[in-house]
């Protein structure tokens, strides 16, 4: 069913690929120790080697199901007719501590399976309590999760997960944190981390909101942990701009959502509009994001330490057409320091009793902020009041690069020898390689120095992942995974072409007269042996 690795790419040597002609691919993760690649798909989970040979396939569907059956028909008989139903993989996470893979699907109201990493053997079934059902929505790129390992030797792991609910707020929370037990058969697996009569580790979309805006939902694009916080980048219906009339035009807004890792009651919930703007054009539809460290040069330019987090994001232009956004898109940069500062200022203002909570979709009323003597510092995790809290001003990123023609769909980044390299997937199946340097001549903060084809004509999906050794980038389309080398220095046949390419990986290796990485060049650290600057070509 799954094809063998085959040739891909254009003028470069063929890229390794893995094709799945029958089942659409949805998610990809790479094991940071072994380099093995796990791929989620419709009705399948695949395990691949680092060079994309198929090692294992696990069948997850189709199953006899009907999304109107709650609980699923395997648990309780259902008056609705059952049919062969695809099981779309919507979440794929590695649980390193327990040596297992968490794979959540769309079938059976959205249950998750744990698979053994070695052979994808299924490690137990959920007990089918209502908490086990995450959401039956089939859209693959709309759920995001962060797995938080328990403290070493004590405490349990937990999963923070966000999902659209397709109007079923009585069945599914949009955001929740759930227990991950060591034993997959444990009845508490996926139970809410905390639950009492008043509060629990979940957030539901109120029925009032759905009555007024039946199309309201929250789509989770990217999630990550930074310090003691979990963040989500989301797209949600903009209830301020969208008319309640179902026939009217839908507008969307991107929000960054933050929770404290150790807040089981979700008192720390804050969300802010997020986006970026260049030359008067607003980019407001988040497509993807990637948490990274800035690299020495960029850190210096931003006034950050090298170990501080930055967030590279891709936004499409405007606020319409979530499913088919405009092609015009922007690569933008945020620092977590600035995001945290904006959030802290908002919380402090609210605890001075200024303004409202400003979260209309969740509160359905304009609750006022309550003045309180509590001290609000960087680590503040909320109280039983002045929450949940919405930001009223958009957090604006720094635009780095605008693509007016192709449409950016995915992003990844890393630090190569102190310089920041960003890879951006496009709608036409290309990977753009971009050097971020805020001190570039001409004031351009980023330089797109190369573009390679991963799969012609097929949009690159969100899970753009680097191999553990940073030699390769795994790019996925609906039908294919492609292993793209982060550099193709060897294609440049002269010193001028090599250094004129502006690829930060490439220099001219004098001993062999080839363009290569520094670490692939013999005696590169001796004088006149490795040219890393165009001026050096003349001297050589």
């Amino acid at each position: 069913e799954a094809g063998l690795p085959r040739a891909g790419g254009g003028s470069q040597p063929p890229f390794r690929t893995f094709s799945a002609s029958d089942w659409g691919l949805t998610h990809l993760v790479v094991h940071e120790q072994t380099g093995e690649v796990y791929v989620g798909a419709v009705n399948r989970i695949y395990k691949l080697s680092g060079n994309l040979t198929l090692l294992r396939a696990h069948v997850t569907g189709p199953v006899e199901d009907n999304e109107k059956c709650y609980p699923p028909p395997s648990v309780q008989s259902c008056p609705h007719g059952l049919g062969s139903t695809d099981n779309v993989n919507k979440l794929l996470l590695l649980d390193y501590a327990a040596n297992r893979l968490l794979a959540c699907g769309s079938a059976s109201q959205g249950i998750c399976q744990f698979l053994r990493l070695d052979d994808l053997f299924k490690l137990g079934e959920p007990h089918h309590r209502k908490e086990h059902y995450l959401s039956s929505v089939q859209e693959a790129g709309s759920m995001a999760g962060v797995l938080i390992a328990g403290p070493p030797g004590q405490g349990q792991a937990k999963l923070f997960v966000g999902t659209p609910i397709d109007g079923k707020s009585e069945y599914f929370p949009t955001l929740s944190s759930r227990r991950l037990m060591a034993n997959e058969e444990d009845a508490d697996m996926f139970g809410f981390v905390y639950q009492d009569e008043f509060v629990s580790s979940q957030l539901k979309i109120p029925s009032d909101t759905l009555s007024k805006f039946p199309a309201f939902d929250i789509y989770y694009v990217y999630s990550f942990r930074s310090e003691q916080f979990v963040y989500y980048l989301t797209l949600q219906l903009d209830t301020q701009l969208t008319s309640p009339d179902a026939a009217g035009e839908h507008f969307f807004t991107s929000k960054i959502v933050r929770l404290c890792v150790d807040d089981p009651k979700f008192y720390s919930y804050v969300e802010f509009p997020i986006g970026c703007e260049q030359a008067g054009v607003e980019y407001r539809l988040v497509q993807d994001a990637y948490l990274s460290r800035p690299g020495r040069a960029l850190a210096h330019q931003l006034g950050l330490a090298e170990d501080e987090d930055v967030l590279f994001t891709v936004f499409a232009q405007g606020q319409k057409n979530r499913v088919k956004p405009p092609k015009e898109s922007a690569l933008c940069l945020f620092t977590l320091r600035a995001i945290k500062e904006k959030i802290k200022e908002r919380i402090q203002s609210c605890y001075r009793g200024e303004g409202k909570l400003s979260l209309p979709w969740l509160l359905n009323k304009e609750l006022g902020c309550i003045n309180s003597p509590l001290q609000i510092d960087d680590d503040f995790c909320g109280q039983d009041f002045n929450q949940p809290l919405g930001g009223t001003v958009t957090i604006e990123g720094t635009p780095l690069f605008v693509d007016k023609d192709d449409g950016l769909t995915a992003v990844a980044a890393y630090d190569y020898r102190g310089r920041t390299v960003v890879f951006a997937g496009t709608r036409s199946g290309r990977i753009r390689k971009i050097l971020v340097d805020l001190s570039n001549p001409g004031g351009r903060p980023a330089l797109a120095y190369e573009s390679v084809v991963a799969q012609e004509g097929s949009p690159i999906l969100r899970d753009l992942v680097l191999s553990p050794n940073h030699q390769y980038l795994y790019a996925m389309t609906e039908k294919q995974v492609t292993r793209v080398p982060v550099e193709s220095c060897v294609q440049y046949t002269s010193c001028e072409l090599c250094l004129g390419s502006r690829d930060p990986h490439c220099g001219w290796c004098v001993l062999h007269s080839i363009c290569s990485r520094r670490d692939a060049c013999e005696r590169a650290d001796e004088p006149q042996r490795f040219a890393a600057d165009l001026l050096q070509c003349v001297q050589l």
Partner: antibody, heavy 122, light 106 residues
Amino acid sequence: QVQLQQSGPGLVKPSQTLSLTCAISGDSLSSTSAAWNWIRQSPSGGLEWLGRTYYRSKWYNDYAVSVKSRITINPDTSKNQFSLQLNSVTPEDTSVYYCARDRGYYNGVDVWGQGTMVTVSS
Amino acid sequence: SYELTQPPSVSVSPGQTASITCSGDKLGDKYASWYQQRPGQSPLLVIYQDNKRPSGIPQRFSGSNSGNTATLTISGTQAMDEADYFCQAWDSGTFVFGTGTKVTIL
């Protein structure tokens, strides 16, 4: 099941200090999701909130403006109890005094003590 | 200071619906709670956050809150519902209670 047990004198002389104690069982005084209140009910039946104490990495108190100058609410974590002191009482302070737990400003007062009738009279 | 006003009394026949109102400036922008107090007993929370019922409170108790008025509705009233009812909201650092309503079952 959370229970609050009140104790203290039922008769206080004018200008003296009214002192009541509330012992908590089934919950912790230091809980970061609860606050511990004193509320009184006048003979005419109206309820008046007096103040609360709560722990959020340190101890805080909120007091009603009407009694702010003469009220103190003290937590005693060693005994898992909290107390009310109301100074310079007058006959207008004659009421049934309740200790109570709230679970946040938005969630109301969900557990009440049995009430103590305090009469201020010479 | 913030004030919450309730009607002093409401009378209703058994099995009928009783509605108790609570008025305050922009009360709909705050969360309202409701308490039942039977003679000689401590108050009991019956509604919080406008319309949520604590566990053990019968479904016949419901609440709403918008504009300047919060309403407690007791549908299918029973003899045991005869009591005083107080609304409550939070404003500017203090809990504020309503004036109270005596519900009489005829």
